[in-house]
């Protein structure tokens, strides 16, 4: 079981008066509705809070919001709803917050129903003033800003028309009509499906892809029989109707849709979906659902063109389109997912990846740990981590399983251990090597989170009472304190820091509930005086990521290379700081046939590393052709793992063969295109 | 088998310096970090600083800080230990041991295969 | 650094004896010590590991316990091989021996 607080946990001294000379309460003169809050810039300290309250009336709905703002990571909050002159903000569209440290934030009104458009407000000095700006039409989505510059804006209209402001909202400008889906792509292009003839609906299937590099000056259709599209990465991807039948298939494009490849994947009918799991620059991972209502699919990971896939899990839990899965990136270490499958007998088990999609495994028994009613066998099972699934079933689980870049390795998540998912309530597991060990952290489910770049996690027990106790740990969940931050115990509804782990405050909100009046408060922690002093070298030790065997030559190898990290030792009490860089250092491997995949007509077949040529091409499910400038495919049968950084070792060269003939398409090829003009 | 074989024993002037080699045979050198600890006659064991070979990242104790380098040749998997400033306090017997490792941590596992130590004599 | 307190210094007792050495962190040290053995003229030898783990090939009689500053080796029936000086050492800081404790025949 978890280490509690006994005589073998190096406590921190004096921490109860440290902990209450840092712990600010703020009361909100606000009715309890609905709470959300927002950070404006990082490291900025800056918060803004939206406080909603909803009475419905017999005719219409009532409504009152409150704007808050916070310079000091929500030590103190001063009340600006008079800034956005006492406006109903639209909770649907939450705070657009903008890019980066640049200030900017939207919010959007409610307006009465006649009105000719809708009302935002804009703020570019981190929510100190806000400009009132009029629209000339009703949005249906939030304001979305470019990636590349702040001032640029578009937003959809309830009539389907596409808007572009090019000075942060003070102008608008209606680009096109008749627009389903709009995206921000890189070097400020958008990319938007269009119909022609009745809705976005009726015309699923036939939509078209378009494109616009100068904010609506000029267009290009890029794209014809368009279902849907999607970025990720480098890549651009569309799902493409089929000439003969009601199926369709991903095609990719890394040219911004100047041309255009067919994905080498099944194809889906009209029951099915494609989802984009997750996509970097150098590759990306695709489920394909299965036919029927199964409730799963499978996961491809693709090659560094977006082309040529190989399969990497069977059965994946994928609830219907827009539904739930588990897939989630370890951000804490690199090439680690964790996600779930569904098996034959209908249970739900972990499995998790450490080289991208390579090879998937159960995660390992935490030590110490019993097996649960799940397990066939009482000596052998395996951890099974709880996520967006379990969530939507409303079991017992608060939150999702948390790693952050900078906190190397660590992983902390609700679970069971068993030979799957159990509905019972869950434990709180953490991991310190990204997901190869795990060890129970805390007993029950908790909400928790990380600060100081993994030097404190925070924990709060998920309960229907009021609460007034909060756990830290400055040892990666070894050893736990409790801190009792109030007298009066709250309502809790949510554990809110900074995103990005570096900060070292944390905000607790909730309600308190008298008998006729129910009130927001929150309180923030700082643990600044708990980590008295900066980190220096000694405090940090050196670790190698993905070890699994040291009596092997390439321990660590993940994908061509092994690195190794500064970590900070579980028994330093310090800071790391606002500024700390995670301190790592690579050494490239040598190449083995691991490391690459086998290229489009080629396959592996089982328990073999080598990739053998298919027979035979045609009639194949998976077949793909390159359409562009290059009209031929040439390929020597094996292709670099996406991101593999091997050197020198096994070199797999084969005869280049030309696969030009064995390929058929239908999609658009760049003579169909054309451009327009606005 | 793993094997650390250290190189000869030294007599050194005060002021001076010394170099050990310690070279490992029979494993994977570069896979583990090697520590220097030294033996006084009649004293304890005090360790002086450690290296991994990959990357050759060294770290020192806080007494030996800047008098001792710590380098490692992975082509012929020897470490090496260089200690300057020789005083008579110095004589002693210096071993180089691996750590042992399970996980990702070098440092954290004990010293799993010892040198047979060198001794290492300043006298004037 | 951390320091480390080893106890007793010398300790007298007979083949057959049940023997226990303790050692102290000035701070916490998680799981993170490792004991060894000594005889004059040899280099030390690794026995225990993270606390409690015997390390391959050293007989079952040594055991390792305790976490966070406190911990203990008992060897559970001295045998005559067993007379020599034994250190602990954590390594969780920078690596710090305890001062050693002998080990001599009554």
């Known amino acids: 079981s978890a280490p509690g607080e006994d005589e073998e946990c190096g406590r921190v001294r004096d921490f109860v008066a440290k902990l209450a000379n840092n712990t600010h309460q703020h009361v909100f003169d606000d009715l309890r509705g609905s709470v959300s809050l927002s950070w404006v810039g990082d490291s900025t300290g800056v918060i803004l809070v939206l406080t909603t309250f909803h009475v419905p009336l017999v005719i219409m709905t009532f409504g009152q919001s409150k704007l808050y703002r916070s310079e000091d990571y929500g030590k103190n909050f001063k009340d600006i709803t008079d800034l956005i002159n006492n406006t109903f903000i639209r909770t649907e569209f939450g705070m657009a917050i903008g890019p980066e440290n640049s200030g900017k934030v939207v919010l959007t009104a409610e307006v009465s129903g006649g009105s000719r458009g809708g009302r935002i407000f804009r703020s570019s000095d981190f929510a100190k003033n806000f400009v009132q700006t009029d629209l000339p039409f009703h949005p249906l989505t939030q304001m979305m800003y470019s990636p590349q510059n702040s001032d640029y804006l578009l937003a959809l209209s309830t009539e389907n028309g596409l808007w572009v402001s090019k000075n942060f909202g003070g102008k608008w400008e209606e680009i096109h009509k008749a627009v389903c889906l709009a995206k921000w792509g890189s070097d400020n292009t958008i990319f938007f499906t269009t119909y022609a003839n009745g809705s976005c609906k009726a015309d699923l299937g036939a939509l078209e892809l378009w494109r616009t590099s100068d904010l609506g000056k000029s267009f290009k259709t890029i794209g014809v029989k368009i279902y849907s599209f999607g970025l990720g990465g480098r890549f651009l991807f569309a799902s493409v109707m089929a000439d003969k039948d009601t199926t369709r298939r991903i095609h990719v494009s890394t040219d911004q849709g100047d041309t255009w490849s067919m994905a080498q994947l099944p194809s889906v009918g009209q029951e099915q979906f494609y989802s984009i799991l997750a996509a970097n620059d150098d590759m990306v991972f695709m489920h394909v659902d299965e036919p029927g209502d199964t409730g799963f699919g499978t996961i491809f990971t693709s090659d560094d063109r977006g082309i040529v896939y190989s399969k990497s899990l069977d059965r994946h839990l994928y609830t219907t389109t827009g539904g739930e899965t588990d897939f989630t990136n370890v951000t804490s270490l690199r090439g680690v997912y964790i996600t779930s499958v569904l098996s034959e007998d209908n249970s739900i088990q972990t499995m998790i990846t450490f080289d991208q999609g390579g090879r998937w495994t159960h995660l390992r028994k935490p030590e110490n740990s019993e097996c649960d009613a799940t397990a066939k066998n009482k000596n052998e099972c395996s951890l099974h981590i709880h996520a967006s699934y379990s969530i939507s079933q409303k079991l017992n689980v608060p939150m999702a399983p948390l790693s952050e870049p900078n906190a190397v390795g660590i992983v902390i998540a609700h679970g069971s251990v068993g030979d799957a998912i159990s509905v019972m309530v869950p434990d709180v597991y953490i991991s310190d090597d990204g997901g190869y060990s795990w060890t129970k952290m805390l007993e029950g489910p908790h909400y928790y989170t990380i600060l100081d770049s993994g030097g404190i996690i925070v924990a709060i027990e998920h309960s229907s009472r009021p609460i007034n106790v909060i756990k830290f740990s400055t040892d990666e969940g070894q050893c736990w304190q409790t801190y009792t931050f109030t007298r009066d115990p709250i309502y809790f509804t949510g554990l809110a820091s900074e995103p990005g782990a570096r900060s070292m405050n944390i905000s607790i909100w909730g309600f308190t509930e008298s008998f006729l009046t129910a009130q927001w408060v929150s309180y923030t922690i700082d643990f600044k005086d708990i980590l008295e002093r900066n980190c220096e070298e000694k405090d940090y030790t050196i670790w190698l990521a993905h070890s699994t065997d040291p009596e092997d030559y390439e321990d660590g190898c993940i994908l061509g290379y092994k690195e190794q990290f500064l970590r900070l030792r579980k028994s330093s009490v310090c800071q790391n700081g606002r500024d700390y860089v995670v301190t790592k250092q690579p050494s490239i491997c040598l190449c083995s046939l691991e490391d690459f995949l086998c290229d489009f007509g080629y396959y592996r077949p089982e328990n073999d590393s080598k990739c053998v040529e298919q027979p035979e091409l045609k009639g194949h499910d998976l077949e793909f052709c390159l359409y562009g400038r290059e009209e031929h495919l040439t390929t020597n049968g094996y292709r670099k793992i996406p991101g593999d950084k091997c050197q020198g070792g096994v070199n797999p060269v084969r005869e280049v063969k030309d696969l030009k003939k064995k390929c058929t398409s239908n999609f658009l090829s760049p003579e169909k295109q054309n451009s327009k003009s606005n | 088998q793993v094997q650390l074989v250290q190189s000869g024993a030294e007599v050194k002037k005060p002021g001076s310096s010394v170099k050990v080699s310690c070279k490992a045979s029979?494993?994977?050198?570069?896979?583990?970090?090697i520590s220097w600890v030294r033996q006084a006659p009649g004293q304890g064991l005090e360790w002086m600083g450690g290296i991994i070979p990959i990357g050759g990242w060294a770290n020192y104790a806080q007494k030996f800080q800047g008098r001792v380098t710590i380098t490692a040749d992975e082509s012929t998997s020897t470490a090496y230990m260089e200690l300057s400033s020789l005083r008579s306090e110095d004589t002693a017997v210096y071993y180089c041991?691996?750590?042992?490792?399970?996980?990702?941590?070098?440092?954290?596992?004990?010293?799993?295969?010892w040198g047979q130590g060198t001794t290492v004599t300043v006298s004037s | 650094d951390i320091q480390m307190t080893q106890s007793p210094s010398t300790l007298s007792a007979s083949v057959g004896d049940r023997v226990t050495i303790t050692c102290r962190a000035s701070?916490?040290?998680?799981?993170?010590l490792a004991w060894y053995q000594q005889k004059p003229g040899k280099a030390p030898k690794l026995l225990i590991y993270?606390?409690?783990s015997l390390e391959s090939g050293v007989p079952s009689r040594f055991s390792g316990s305790g976490s966070g500053t406190e911990f203990t080796l008992t060897i559970s029936s001295l045998q005559p091989d067993d007379f020599a000086t034994y250190y602990c050492?954590?390594?969780?800081?920078?690596?710090?021996f305890g001062g050693g404790t002998k080990v001599e025949i009554k």
């Open positions: 041991a691996r750590q042992g490792r399970k996980t990702g941590y070098y440092y954290y596992y004990g010293m799993d295969v």
């Open positions: 993270k606390a409690s």
């Open positions: 050492q954590q390594a969780d800081g920078h690596i710090t």
């Open positions: 029979g494993g994977t050198f570069r896979n583990y970090a």
């Open positions: 701070q916490s040290i998680s799981s993170w």
